[in-house]
């Protein structure tokens, strides 16, 4: 028995930040779980982890240097990534694992979300136009 995960097909990070919502076919209320976000087609980089259990505050961390936060809904976890770089444009996959109560459950691999990180373009101000061409 596998949990199904829904993600937006694509998100654009205009200000080097993005909210990626992972929606599950499973209610996480009063469960011990590990929700994680993975980068790349092979999910090689674990970007962020949200750990939750019935008796403790939500714990969010990244072992790979990403600036991330997480919010919990009954059937969702939203990852908030900040300070993204243009070269971190990639496909990102949500993963959910329920550790307690038994049995252990995880998800069918989702289709993923392409996060397109747009660089900050500094447009010339109309008050100070660039040098005019001859």
């Amino acid at each position: 028995n596998k949990i199904l995960v829904k993600q937006s097909p694509m998100l654009v990070a205009y200000d080097n930040a993005v909210n990626l919502s992972c929606k599950y076919s499973y209610n996480l209320f009063s469960r011990e779980f590990r929700a994680s976000l993975h980068k790349g087609l092979d999910s090689a980089v674990e970007v962020c982890v949200v750990y939750g259990n019935y008796s403790q505050q939500l714990q969010v961390y990244s072992k790979t240097g990403f600036n991330c936060d997480g919010k919990l809904g009954n059937e969702s976890v939203t990852f908030y990534l900040q300070n993204l770089y243009v070269n971190q444009t990639d496909i990102y996959f949500c993963k959910i694992e329920v550790m307690y109560p038994p049995p252990y459950l995880d998800n069918e691999k989702s289709n993923g979300t392409i996060i397109h990180v747009k660089g900050k373009h500094l447009c010339p101000s109309p008050l100070f136009p660039g040098p005019s061409k001859p």
């Epitope: 011990e32 590990r34 750990y51 939750g52 072992k63 240097g65 694992e97 550790m99 307690y100 252990y104």
Partner: antibody, heavy 120, light 107 residues
């Protein structure tokens, strides 16, 4: 209280195999990895590998990948480490320890250690 | 694999001394560094996790600092029960690796 209790000392001949057990109690077995770490006489600590009892996924140190086998029996909250084709330099104390599956970075509880002596 | 190196490999100190042990990682491990104490014939005991967090029940004379590649364990005032071997361990990426250890002996 939280405990990891290991099986007793073993003496083996070169080429043989050894299987060490680690019985967990006092916590939810499927919330933690079980890791195996060894320490040769007078030497430092060497990580062998780990297993997660929830889905029995394993991670191995490349050095031990073809000789170590990690298993669990969740019905009795026990983990096992089998090391095959033993050599004299496998003589060591073997420890089991745990790390949290959701917050996995340190080893907070250790077994008492199992001495394995390999000698002809 | 991430290599962990510790210095010194051994040191002699007296009760009441301030003792500092350093640990170096071969690549950036952010704060994913733990410290353990081991006495002869016993299993290691966790002292510090995530570079600077004191594990439950560990005396406050132990402290840890650092991030990235360089880390420090400090014992502010050495007690008789602190004579032991100290190990650092990186928990950033598998395979988890330990340093060679520092043996703290009585002067």
């Amino acid at each position: 209280q939280v405990q990891l209790v290991q099986s007793g000392a073993e003496v083996k001949k070169p080429g043989a195999s050894v299987k060490v057990s680690c019985k967990a109690s006092g916590y939810t077995f499927t919330s933690y990895y079980i890791h195996w770490v060894r320490q040769a006489p007078g030497q430092g600590l060497e990580w062998i590998g780990c297993i997660y009892p929830g889905n029995v996924n394993t991670n191995y140190n490349e050095k031990f990948k073809d000789r170590a086998t990690l298993t669990v029996d969740t019905s009795i909250s026990t983990a096992y480490m089998e090391l095959s084709r033993l050599r004299s330099d496998d003589t060591a104390v073997y420890f089991c320890t745990r790390s949290h599956y959701g917050l996995d970075w340190n080893f907070d509880v250790w077994g008492q250690g199992t001495t394995v002596t390999v000698s002809s | 694999d991430i290599q962990m190196t510790q210095s010194p490999s051994s040191l002699s100190a007296s009760v009441g001394d301030r003792v500092t042990i350093t640990c170096h990682a071969s690549q950036n491990i952010y704060v994913w560094l733990n410290w353990y104490q081991q006495k002869p014939g016993k299993a290691p005991k966790l002292l510090i996790y995530k570079a600077s967090n004191l594990h439950t029940g560990v005396p406050s004379r132990f402290s840890g600092s650092g991030s990235g590649t360089d880390f420090t364990l400090t014992i502010s005032s050495l007690q008789p029960e602190d004579f032991a071997t100290y190990y650092c361990q990186q928990g950033q990426t598998y395979p988890y690796t330990f340093c060679g250890g520092t043996k703290v002996e009585i002067k």
